[in-house]
């Protein structure tokens, strides 16, 4: 199957400078997220400028098929991949000037999913077997959000709406969205 990623120009998303993210919903066992409970860098703002409009977050359009075993959606679905680190728009890839990638020294602002949309998808199976329709949740927009000591790098891929985020530690499967043929393309995703 051809898993395709289509890049658009960077979309400017204003970071929520004063906001500390709520920990995502978790199960009782608190193992949903790989939290750094101790340590972490002090929570100070990494940005020198006071003009928050200078900071951007890239939204990549990602088109894929929904699959369940041998069954595949009749049509591909398109969602967004929230890509890379939030930084000055002038230094983002695709921005005018093609400047060097900017990385703050303090706590990260990250480009993460903001809103989701649900879509019902009809699957088709080989041999004419009739599968049921499925509902998928697709990223509809992204935002810059400040990461505090509660979040570490490995958690970036787990920002999302699910209550019972599955545990994926037993197999070395890539975690990033679009982790098929375009894995390198989306190296910075989430």
């Amino acid at each position: 199957q051809g898993w395709q990623a289509f890049k658009n120009d960077a979309t400017e998303i204003i970071p929520e400078l004063g906001e500390y993210p709520e920990p995502p919903p978790e199960l009782e066992n608190n193992k949903t997220m790989n939290r750094a409970e101790n340590g972490g860098r002090p929570p100070h703002h990494p940005f020198e400028t006071k003009d928050v409009s200078e900071y951007s977050c890239r939204e990549l359009h990602f088109t894929r098929y929904v699959t369940d075993g041998q069954c595949r959606s009749a049509k591909p679905v398109t969602e967004l991949v929230c890509s890379g680190q939030c930084g000055p728009a002038r230094l983002l890839p695709n921005a005018i000037g093609r400047g060097k990638w900017w990385r703050p020294s303090g706590p990260d602002f990250r480009c993460i999913p903001d809103r989701y949309r649900a879509q019902r998808v009809q699957l088709l199976c080989p041999g004419g077997a009739a599968p049921r329709a499925r509902k998928v949740r697709l990223v509809a927009s992204c935002k810059c959000k400040r990461l505090t000591r509660f979040h570490n790098q490995s958690e970036l891929k787990d920002f999302g709406p699910e209550a019972a985020r599955p545990q994926k530690g037993r197999k070395p499967r890539p975690r990033a969205r679009g982790a098929k043929a375009n894995q390198a393309e989306l190296e910075n995703a989430y």
Partner: antibody, heavy 124, light 106 residues
Framework: EVQLVQSGAEVKKPGESLKISCKGS????????IHWVRQMPGKGLEWMGQ????????EYAPRFQGQVTISADKSISTAYLQWSSLKASDTAMYYC?????????????????WGQGTTVTVSS | EIVLTQSPATLSLSPGERATLSCSAS?????IHWYQQKPGQAPRLLIY???ELASGIPARFSGSGSGTDFTLTISSLEPEDFAVYYC?????????FGGGTKVEIK
């Protein structure tokens, strides 16, 4: 906390009607399929049907088709299971469950959130 | 309708022993999901998509299989593992559960 909260236990007489509820907390039920599962005393789990609260589309297991009605009110994030005329054989525990979804290069679905169950007792 | 048959119906084992539960489908399914239910509680997800461990579930639980034959394995039973286990298929309507396997203390 993401959860499904079901209405309380019911004791009814044969022939009476009943509507039990399942309310989504900290998520919108319209974004997921909500399922109803029956468990008769000392027995296993039986899938009754599902609803897409976004548009009210339902599917039923053949044995429950015409016996119960599944509905939802997405504005209050609540799904319902109702009977127009109860029988003694409807005595059971009824669970609602959310069909969760996850994508990491593969698509995954599973019943990730369950209600606490509603006990329905039908006895003359 | 895809019928899921679980065997054995009851498994009597001691803590520390290995438990192997089977689920056989009447026709091929993409994946099987496993749930654990304790008395007076709602079921809880253990294994999804045949072999993926759900959040917070200990690594002593594992799943395998394909097509029509699937297995849930508990490598070393802990006291809290004594419960009823159900397999489920979500691929085709009507959705179906297996009849359950009760794992009891020997």
């Amino acid at each position: 906390e993401v959860q499904l909260v079901q209405s309380g236990a019911e004791v009814k007489k044969p022939g009476e009607s009943l509507k039990i509820s399942c309310k989504g907390s900290d998520f919108e039920i319209k974004d997921y399929y909500i399922h109803w599962v029956r468990q008769m005393p000392g027995k296993g789990l039986e899938w009754m049907g599902q609803i897409d609260a976004e548009d009210g589309e339902t599917e039923y297991a053949p044995r429950f088709q015409g016996q119960v009605t599944i509905s939802a009110d997405k504005s209050i994030s609540t799904a319902y299971l109702q009977w127009s005329s109860l029988k003694a054989s409807d005595t059971a525990m009824y669970y609602c469950a959310r069909e969760g979804y996850y994508y990491d290069g593969r698509d995954y679905w599973y019943f990730d959130v369950w209600g606490q169950g509603t006990t329905v007792t039908v006895s003359s | 309708e895809i019928v899921l048959t679980q065997s054995p119906a009851t498994l009597s084992l001691s803590p520390g022993e290995r438990a192997t539960l089977s689920c056989s489908a009447s026709s091929s399914v993409s994946y099987i999901h496993w749930y654990q239910q304790k008395p007076g509680q709602a079921p809880r997800l253990l294994i999804y998509s045949t072999s993926e461990l759900a959040s917070g579930i200990p690594a002593r639980f594992s799943g395998s299989g394909s097509g029509t034959d699937f297995t849930l394995t508990i490598s070393s039973l802990e006291p809290e593992d004594f419960a009823v286990y159900y397999c489920q298929q979500l691929s085709h309507l009507p959705l179906t559960f297996g009849g359950g396997t009760k794992v009891e203390i020997k």
